[in-house]
Amino acid sequence: KKKEKVKKGSECSEWTWGPCTPSSKDCGMGFREGTCGAQTQRVHCKVPCNWKKEFGADCKYKFESWGACDGSTGTKARQGTLKKARYNAQCQETIRVTKPCTSKTKSKTKAKKGKGKD
């Protein structure tokens, strides 16, 4: 959610705005809800269909290979670097994802399945 400060006399000073939610399907006209204390506000918004159909996710990352298993946490990690973002999506430049360690055979199978994918 986005926070924005609006100073207009005695009006609310900091509104938090949610995402634009289309009224039907996954694009087109919809509403964005804002809250400030006990106040709420709904504004019309639009998710252009040519953004949604080109790529489903707002943020696409290119991932490195999974790192070694960390015995203390039982997880392994890999880093992703931003590859492409929807024009208005405020994506992190890099992200770090973790997953539980599995047995060697499972790991190999998963690695083969995921090969070549971002």
Epitope: W17, K46, P48, K84, Q92, E93
Partner: antibody, heavy 117, light 107 residues
């Protein structure tokens, strides 16, 4: 930070074509949308279109569909604007800018294209 | 396409005064509105993105409000270096469009 250096402008005769270059240095050229904007002398800003270097997805202002072609060369960290069938009204300063919704944008210095016989 | 109308076309102020620049969209554009400053012979410079989000390196005297159709750029106390042309731009739908600009001049 991204630095954008533009080149390729100059005097061109009506009906001719011109290719403008926008060379990027610094981080992550390929991750961000590259916009092209022009500004006629003494006038406002006009968006031509944009291209994403990662896959060359291009979105063009329909006004320029028969006039402009956008391309990129990731190996050279460069974006290009090809302008065809130039006319006097295409005389303008042309800008490239790299856009990130998270951090904002970076602009080239602009390059002047003068169309005259 | 979405039309952005900026007012006033020219704003004459003295340094130290408060500047209020308006940008009205022909339809709701949520908060997908950005403000630029342009000085003669220079490229535009982004001041505010998404109606009210500040940009690194831009002085705190610049602020913006929205969302919807009516947007405002406020300069709390105008400095001599602020005299320039200001443009709003929408990124809600294609084509991206700019307002006609507001020239902030010294009174």
């Amino acid at each position: 930070q991204v630095q954008l250096v533009q080149s390729g402008g100059g005097l061109v005769k009506p009906g001719h074509s011109l290719r403008l270059s926008c060379a990027a240095s610094g981080q992550s050229f390929s991750s961000y949308w590259m916009n092209w904007v022009r500004q006629a002398p003494g006038k406002g800003l006009e968006w031509i279109g944009m291209i994403h270097p990662s896959d060359s997805e291009t979105i063009l202002n329909q006004k320029f569909k028969d006039k402009a072609t956008l391309s990129v060369d990731i190996a050279k960290n460069s974006a290009y604007l090809q302008m065809n069938s130039l006319r006097a009204e295409d005389t303008a300063v042309y800008y490239c800018s790299s856009w990130s919704a998270k951090r904002g944008d970076f602009w080239g210095q602009g390059t002047l294209v003068t169309v005259s016989s | 396409e979405i039309v952005l109308t900026q007012s006033p076309a020219t704003l004459s102020l003295s340094p130290g005064e408060r500047a209020t620049l308006s940008c009205r969209a022909s339809e709701s554009i949520s908060n997908n509105l950005h403000w630029y400053q342009q000085k003669p012979g220079q490229a535009p410079r982004l001041l505010i993105k998404y109606a009210s989000q500040s940009i690194s390196g831009i002085p705190a005297r610049f602020s913006g409000s929205g969302p919807g159709t009516d947007f405002t750029l406020t300069i709390s106390s105008v400095e001599p270096e602020d005299f320039a042309v200001y443009y709003c731009q929408q990124s809600n739908s294609w084509p991206l469009t700019f307002g006609g600009g507001t020239k902030l001049e010294i009174k």
